[in-house]
């Protein structure tokens, strides 16, 4: 007996499709093996359709794949546009030839089935309302109406022309006439259930003369959609439930044992486990809605369901949609930490990952809010300048073509603790979610500025030391001067990184940045930072101020801005002092710089599509022709 | 919530045939898959058939221990999936368990008792030599 396993018999009609799946014993060689699928002729040769190695015939051509999952030591097979030539025998296998480990399937599609003339089908989904038409002669215009549902016996009311109605249709079945028209009755049935479904008749007149007509409702569940997403991806159900519940509270679900829980709703109800994850986002008056989930764990794999009704939670006889997730652990999502750790004071580093095909796609980095249905503001991004509130202490690095972006936050406080997306205009899928975790500083930061209370005088020769221990000796130390637009890197040589030294003395390490002559424009935040290749590290911020020489005092009083500026963090990083630049100026910031909501961030369309320099943080705006000197002590 | 009940069980000779039943009742909109296991006394639990439907398509499954001789079937309009058990012998002696689920296709592994969110009762089968 063979040790792979599927359905024996498949059957189905004309026009529709199939989805086999076929299990394998749980073993490294059958997880990477090749899987096939073969069709069995008279000769007993099997004929390769599809394989997990790119081959397609040319009959499945656009209308059938093949899926592993081999974390689950199965392979999918989608069959659609199924016809009746389908019909046959077949094996769902593994091993690079035909005849390695297989198992029998036999395919009949048949004809779709015609009904009987004199029947009117109504078919319905769950939740949703039919119209029954029931027309009759002039002369029964005077006699009662009525739709009763078939039984093994007998044929039990619904409703009548009298007002009796069924207990079981009380506030769902209305019998009705339109205008004038005196030829056609209608009955309406609301909030369909399963047990609504069968063979009704409605009639008109009593005896011989009586008008009949046969009624056939079926009523379905909907079909779980098929999702297949990657670990750490993201997913968005779109959920469209119609007009009649546009005004009710909407949820999504996720079936247990007996019930479905509600993951999140309308009404403010979220579950823990997706906290700073998710989004509901209503779409518009039609009763349609989407559910945003990132950072997809391994046990978000399930059963979903989204529905309406005014309490938030599901009920029957409403209707609903949905969905099978399964989440593929060969993902293409790099892992990446899912929580970054820094301390008051400090600062943090965040390599966001993005689709290395989609190089210069817009970036962003927002923050999630629970609040209401959930929402995430956008704070930096390529062409989206920094919002006010972060200003000095924020900025996005995007290092074209290698999949990554860095966005930088310093100055951290405990109010900065909370969830945090990366995010891009383009594949959707890239979204990832950060929980950023502040905890108070309990020792001194690991880069220090001297002097802290900087003030530079107009004109004179300003110079500002960056103080560094020697665990960071070997790496790049950078001065970037900051705007809303990102963080420019002021270009330097570090002639200490040059000289061989055999000890370091924690108490001499410095990176110094010279301003000379000081201009108007050199006022600002700068930072001093430390990197490793193209992996961004701790930072530091300093906030210096240019002002005129007042008469009688060489220096003016300094500012408090740098209350904030002190920092410490654990990841390596840059080493620079500055010489001068001129930078090019980052286009116009896009529609994001005015809606900075992303409260459709699963709205692809809702995102910022401008294409741009994306290639760039870089924004300052520095005219003065200053010298800056890397001195080493 | 999804009652099931299995009937159709009883003694019988080798080389007979039964039928079992599993009417469902409740909310049997949601279901998507039927299972039938079966459980000899001293052993564990093991798979014998199950259906699952997906729209039109109909796809059944069963086990290498029955293949040939046990037919799994369903009547849509009555809510009730059928075992048909023909070539009886000894060794089918156990009690049959039917279980119903809400998950389609793929969905989990039809032959894992986990797979099954609802369960009936059970129906004995004795095959006599």
């Known amino acids: 007996k063979s040790p792979i396993f599927g359905p024996q018999e498949v059957s189905s009609i004309e026009g529709d499709s199939v989805s086999i799946t076929c299990y394998y014993p749980d073993t490294s060689v059958n997880r990477h093996t090749r899987k096939y699928w073969c069709r069995q002729g008279a000769s007993g040769m099997c004929t390769t359709l599809i394989s997990s190695n790119g081959y397609l015939s040319k009959e499945y051509s656009g209308r059938a794949n093949l899926i592993n999952f081999p974390e689950n030591n199965t392979f999918v097979i989608n069959i659609e546009q199924l016809t009746q030539d389908d019909t046959g025998s077949y094996k769902c296998g593994l091993g690079t030839s035909n005849r390695g480990l297989s198992f029998d399937v036999s395919l009949e599609v048949s004809q779709v089935p015609e009904l009987p003339s004199d029947t009117h089908v109504y078919t319905k989904d769950i939740g949703r309302n039919v119209t029954i038409e029931c027309p009759f002669k002039r002369e029964n215009a005077p006699s009662k109406k009525s739709l009763c549902k078939k039984t093994n016996q007998s044929c039990e009311l619904v409703i009548d022309s009298t007002e009796k109605v069924n207990p079981s249709y009380i506030g769902r079945a209305k019998l009705f006439m339109k205008g004038t028209d005196l030829t056609v009755f209608y009955v309406n049935i609301s909030h369909l259930t399963h047990n609504d479904a069968g063979l009704y008749i409605c009639q008109a007149g009593e005896g011989p003369s009586a008008d009949k007509k046969n009624v056939d409702l079926q009523v379905l569940a909907p079909e779980p959609e098929l999702l297949y997403k990657d670990l750490r991806s993201s997913v968005t159900f779109e959920c469209d439930l119609g007009r009649e519940v546009a005004n009710e509270a909407k949820y999504l679900c996720r079936m247990n044992k007996e019930t479905c829980d509600v993951i999140i709703n309308t009404l403010g109800k979220r579950d823990p486990d997706f906290e700073g994850r998710i989004l509901i986002t209503p779409k518009d008056d039609n009763g349609r809605f989407s559910v945003l989930i990132t950072g997809l764990r391994k046990e978000d794999a399930g059963h979903y369901q989204c529905g309406a009704h005014s309490s938030g939670l599901p009920q029957e006889g409403w209707p609903i949609q949905t969905w099978q997730l399964f989440v593929n652990e060969e993902s293409t999502i790099p892992n990446r930490r899912s929580v970054v750790k820094g301390v008051t004071g400090g600062s943090v580093a965040i390599a966001c990952p993005y689709n290395p095909k989609e190089s210069s796609s817009l970036k962003y980095w927002c923050r999630w809010e629970g609040d209401g249905n959930g929402h995430c503001p956008v704070l930096v991004g390529t062409q989206a300048q920094v919002q006010e509130e972060y200003e000095g202490r924020l900025a996005l690095f995007d290092q074209p073509g290698n999949g990554t972006y860095t966005v930088i936050l310093n100055q951290l406080t405990t109010e900065d603790a909370g969830f945090y997306w990366c995010l891009t205009n383009g594949d959707s899928r890239w979204r990832t979610t950060i929980e950023l975790q502040v905890a108070e500083a309990t020792r001194e930061p690991n880069l220090e500025v001297t002097p802290q209370n900087a003030t530079a005088v107009l004109g004179e020769t300003f110079t500002v030391s960056c103080h560094y221990p020697c665990k960071f000796y070997s790496q790049e130390k950078y001065w970037c001067k900051w705007s809303n637009k990102g963080c420019h890197i002021l270009p330097s040589h570090d002639e200490g990184a040059r000289q061989s030294s055999v000890s370091c003395d924690q108490s001499s390490q410095l990176v110094s940045m010279t301003l000379n002559p000081v201009s108007k424009e050199d006022e600002g935040w700068y930072w001093c930072g430390v990197k490793q290749g193209q992996t961004y590290g701790e930072t530091t911020a300093i906030y210096i101020a240019v002002e005129e020489r007042t008469r009688g005092s060489s220096h003016v009083n300094p500012t408090d801005a740098n209350a904030r500026a002190k920092v410490a963090l654990e990841e390596e990083v840059v080493d620079s002092s500055i010489s001068e630049k001129e930078n090019k100026a980052i286009p116009n910031p896009g529609p994001f710089a005015n809606e900075r909501e992303i409260q459709n961030v699963g709205d692809q369309a809702q995102e910022n599509r401008a294409s741009g320099d994306a290639g760039s943080a870089d924004g300052q705006s520095r005219s003065s022709s200053s010298k800056h000197h890397h001195h080493h002590h | 919530q999804v009652q099931l009940v299995e009937s159709g069980g009883g003694l019988v000779q080798t080389g007979g045939s039964l039928r079992l039943s599993c009417a469902a009742s409740g909310r049997t909109f949601s279901v998507y898959r039927v299972g039938w296991f079966r459980q000899a006394p001293g052993k564990e639990r093991e798979f014998v058939a199950a259906?699952?439907?997906?729209?039109?398509?109909?796809?059944?499954y069963a086990a290498d221990s029955v293949k040939g001789r046990f037919t799994i079937s369903r009547d849509n309009a009555e809510n009730t999936v059928y075992l048909q058990m023909n070539s009886l012998k000894p060794e089918d002696t156990a009690v049959y368990y039917c279980?119903?689920?809400?998950?389609?296709?793929?969905?989990?592994?039809?032959?894992?008792?986990?797979?099954?969110?609802?369960w009936g009762q059970g129906t004995l089968v004795t095959v006599s030599s």
């Open positions: 279980a119903a689920d809400p998950l389609g296709l793929p969905g989990p592994d039809v032959r894992v008792e986990g797979g099954y969110r609802h």
């Open positions: 259906v699952i439907w997906s729209g039109a398509s109909t796809y059944k």
